[in-house]
């Protein structure tokens, strides 16, 4: 039900009052303000923006706004010794060099401190050797190369196209294949939508545009030098050799003009099939090395970036709850950007700013939420989710006892086609109910609900008449809250039409061309999609903080658990003989899911009927809802990934951005046919089934009647 029931207020102070206060024009103004100069993590400019946001949140009316600082490992190019890649001839002369930086967008020619494209945390090095083209550098791409084509990447420099999976996974895969360097590039097939112009004339990537990004494999650790603990003044720091997740080989990103020059000379094997061909006018030969006349030429990388312990600043704002101040609903998004951050993150930060302003306006009129709302502007997200993770590590005891929900607020848009939501199943009904109350901003859906346009454009693959809601993966600041601490989490943004635009992310992602003008001219001139996202994010926070009974439906978890159990069982059943040989049974898991379903159903019945005027019973029922997500946490974590502790969901081991269900079982089954010791491998499958079954059963019991 909708919540008019917050304390100390007249009936007008309900969700509608909060939503009506949100204004597209304000979001536009905030976005402009946040995007005029770069706000790279660890820089003075980003510290100044933190102080500005702190000051404005105080003005908006929050009870307190503090800066929380940490000293974490960051990575920067050497200002006097630029990174680049060259083709060298047999005499060692550089006959071709890649660009040192991107041509600046119009109007920004005189802006200083634009960091040139680089792969953050690349080690230094100047490897030279033959090139091997490895497609997207996914696990399956290396399987194709090594197993089917018998191509050895050992001692080679590999060139991979961006897209499909997180870049850190590409680098990890290349390292495991024995490569001595990695070149990442944006292929027009993935970053240039047909029929659209390059920036500044459209939202496509120009040939000189390059995607920055970190290449870590942190697996939720946060600061590489202080895994598990905050990087505070008295922190013990690991030596760089023991740091978590750092790549061991040089890595550098380039645009497609430079990629053309490297790829056009490639010889060796032809691409195995059309899925390995991009849109450049090159053969996409795999290599190794250059063809015929150019076979004596090599590729040389020149990487001189440095890793430095640097101070970062989160901004933490508090709006104290009137009834349950010890229950926290958190809205957080990052502030640091690679350059101007026109979309990532400032389209999200501008929305958070307007949500804070709206809440502040209500508070100034005498209203308070039932529960405490925490607002966060995270730093160093781009360097591995560092700001959010360090803060959560510092406050983990409070969060695990008091955390109701976390709503993420990075980029508000990655397109302007329809809504995209990833969240815990506990929030499905909240999202459905909220979007039914909001107006759709989409053309052709005037007067219709957001739910209707979303369902029409992005239907659920399982349930007709419902919209698609995806699993949470990682690659954003919800990670520590959901995957490590087990706090119910969700995220929402406007997205592209994945049917017609099969490029990865949006074309100008992490490039210098992600400007205010990109958004204002091409994506959302009226800022109506930003406003809708503000209403969804803000509306979720409002309901979570203000409804008497938490708006979580545990029955939706029961439904997905059955679906995930069926899916993992069907994967395992691809090996019927081994399942028989090693006595592998999923009975315990299906039994636990059945029990969870029954207990969740009974809990939901009690939830309808209990006396909501009894504060003790109300608190008890709400605590059972709040702690349900927590019950899916295994304190020991997943194998080799101690900070991924959620048993139902984890980031895919092959793509950090994607969520995997029953990840422990999934990883145990992955490529099991190639394991040298099948008995041990199937033993691990059985152990993971046991862990999953136990966890589901234990979670179910938290919903049982308490006595």
């Amino acid at each position: 039900k909708s919540s008019n029931e917050a304390t100390n207020i007249t009936p007008k102070h309900n969700m509608k009052a909060f939503l009506d206060e949100l204004k597209a024009e304000n979001i536009k103004k905030f976005l402009y303000n946040f995007t005029q100069i770069p706000h790279l993590a660890g820089t003075e400019q980003n510290f100044q923006l933190a102080k500005q946001i702190q000051s404005q949140w105080k003005e908006f009316g929050l009870d307190s706004v503090e800066l929380a600082h940490y000293d974490v490992l960051l990575s920067y190019p050497n200002k006097t010794h630029p990174n680049y890649i060259s083709i060298i001839n047999e005499d060692g002369n550089e006959i071709f060099n890649t660009s040192l930086f991107e041509p600046p967008p119009p109007g920004y020619e005189n802006v200083s401190d634009i960091v040139p494209p680089f792969s953050a945390f690349s080690p230094q090095g100047m490897p030279e050797g033959d090139l091997v083209y490895v497609n997207y550098a996914r696990t399956e791409d290396f399987f194709k190369l090594e197993r089917d084509m018998k191509i050895n990447c050992s001692g080679k420099i590999v060139i991979a196209r961006y897209g499909k999976v997180f870049r850190g996974n590409k680098v990890k895969n290349a390292q495991l294949a024995g490569a001595k360097g990695v070149i990442l590039y944006s292929d027009p097939a993935d970053y240039f939508a047909p029929g659209v112009k390059s920036y500044p004339d459209g939202w496509n990537l120009p040939g000189g545009g390059v995607q920055r990004g970190n290449i870590l494999n942190l697996n939720g650790a946060g600061d590489p030098l202080t895994p598990g603990y905050p990087a505070n003044e008295y922190a013990y720091r690991r030596g760089i050799a023991e740091a978590v997740g750092l790549p061991s080989i040089p890595v550098h990103p380039i645009g497609y003009y430079d990629a053309q020059k490297l790829l056009e000379k490639m010889g060796g094997s032809a691409p195995p099939d059309s899925s390995w061909r991009g849109s450049l006018k090159v053969p996409y030969n795999v290599g190794p090395g250059f063809t015929g006349n150019f076979s004596t030429q090599k590729v040389k990388m020149h990487i001189h970036s440095t890793n430095e312990v640097t101070r970062i600043y989160n901004v933490i704002g508090t709006l104290r709850g009137a009834v349950e101040p010890d229950r926290y609903v958190i809205l957080g998004g990052h502030r640091d950007s690679w350059v101007f951050g026109g979309i990532d993150p400032q389209s999200g930060a501008a929305v958070v700013h307007e949500i804070v302003r709206s809440f502040g306006t209500l508070k100034k009129e005498g209203w308070r939420p039932r529960r405490t709302i925490l607002f966060a502007s995270w730093d160093a997200e781009e360097f591995g989710l560092l700001g959010s993770t360090e803060w959560a590590e510092e406050n983990s005891r409070l969060l695990q006892e008091r955390g109701v929900a976390y709503i993420n607020a990075d980029s508000s848009i990655e397109g302007n086609y329809t809504l995209r939501v990833d969240c815990t199943p506990l929030m499905y009904s909240l999202v459905h109910n909220l979007t039914k109350e909001l107006k759709s901003p989409d053309e052709g859906f005037e007067g219709k609900s957001l739910y209707e346009s979303w369902t029409k454009k992005s239907p659920s693959p399982e349930f007709s008449g419902m919209p698609r809601i995806s699993k949470l993966g990682s690659g954003n600041d919800f990670e520590v809250f959901f995957q490590r601490l087990g706090i119910a989490s969700g995220r929402a943004r406007y997205t592209k039409n994945w049917e017609t635009n099969k490029f990865s992310g949006y074309p100008l992602y992490h490039s210098v061309y992600e400007t205010y003008e990109l958004v204002e001219k091409f994506y959302d001139p009226m800022f109506k999609y930003h406003l809708t996202v503000a209403q969804v994010r803000g509306g979720m926070v409002f309901e979570l903080a203000n409804s008497i009974v938490l708006p979580f439906d545990c029955r939706d978890y029961a439904v997905v658990l059955r679906k995930y159990a069926d899916k993992i069982y069907s994967i395992s059943m691809k090996h019927p003989q081994e399942m028989k040989t090693y006595s592998v049974s999923f009975d315990s898991l299906f039994s636990a899911v059945k029990n969870f379903t029954e207990i969740a159903s009974k809990f939901s019945e009690r939830l309808q009927d209990f006396d909501k005027s009894n504060p003790i019973v109300l608190r008890m029922m709400n605590d059972q809802l709040m702690f349900l997500e927590r019950a899916f946490i295994d304190p020991l974590g997943l194998p080799d990934r101690p900070f991924y502790r959620h048993v139902i969901y984890a980031p895919s081991s092959h793509n950090k951005y994607a969520g995997e269900s029953f990840p422990g079982i999934y990883d145990a089954l992955f490529d099991i046919e190639s394991k040298v010791d099948p008995s041990k491998a199937w033993g691990e499958v059985k152990r993971q089934i046991y862990v999953a079954a136990f966890t589901v059963q234990a979670a179910a019991e938290t919903l049982s009647e308490v006595a």
Partner: antibody, heavy 119, light 107 residues
């Protein structure tokens, strides 16, 4: 075959105006920027401005800003350079050229048209 | 604005010679430098863009190198058809600017 053909040059009085035309053929007109470059007798090349027929965006060199106006007629695949308040130092051969994108070099040029500013 | 300084202004050479022309930018322009050849009474012709990318149809004796602020055009073996004036031009930011030109004449 890509062709750019300038016309409209000639003798102009100081303080006067002129309009140069650049007729484009052999490619999709709106897919390329049109640039204007001039060369005073015996001197080097000077870029004076660009026009993007796709969205009508213009850029000008400081030396002609406020006196030059770039435009196109898409139906005729023709670009125009209007120059006002002409001075003796505007005497030059005026070339039009095209480039693929905002950041790309000029790959095709017209043959040029001479403008002489003199009384 | 980016200033481009080109040297030498005149270069005397013979057929078969290796010829080098240099351009220096007032600030780093990455590799966004183009080279043009112009013959008397004719329009300039694009030889090289983005520092080292040879325009299609241009003989391979022409090559470009450099990045940042220092760039070089090299003609590996001067041919009779190569006696002309050569201009460099930065194409990274507006206003686009040219070097003053280098006239390659017969020794």
């Amino acid at each position: 075959e890509v062709q750019l053909l300038e016309s409209g040059g000639g003798l102009v009085q100081p303080g006067g105006s002129l309009r140069l035309s650049c007729a484009a053929s052999g490619y999709t007109f709106t897919d390329y920027y049109i640039h204007w470059v001039r060369q005073a007798p015996g001197k080097g090349l000077e870029w004076i401005g660009s026009f993007n027929p796709y969205n009508d965006y213009t850029s000008y060199a400081d030396s002609v800003k406020g006196r030059a106006t770039l435009s196109v007629d898409k139906s005729k695949n023709t670009a125009y350079l209007q120059m006002n308040s002409l001075r003796a130092e505007d005497t030059a051969v005026y070339y039009c050229a095209r480039s693929d994108g905002y950041y790309d070099a000029m790959d095709y040029w017209g043959q040029g048209t001479l403008v002489t500013v003199s009384s | 604005d980016v200033q481009i300084t080109q040297s030498p202004s005149t270069l005397s050479a013979s057929v078969g010679d290796r010829v080098t022309i240099t351009c220096r930018a007032s600030k780093s322009i990455s590799k966004y430098l183009a080279w043009y050849q112009q013959k008397p009474g004719k329009a300039p012709k694009l030889l090289i863009h983005s520092g080292s990318s040879l325009e299609s149809g241009v003989p391979s004796r022409f090559s470009g190198s450099g990045s940042g602020t220092e760039f070089t055009l090299t003609i590996s073996s001067l041919q009779p058809d190569d006696f002309a004036t050569y201009y460099c031009q930065q194409h990274i930011e507006y206003p686009w600017t040219f070097g003053q030109g280098t006239k390659v004449e017969i020794k």
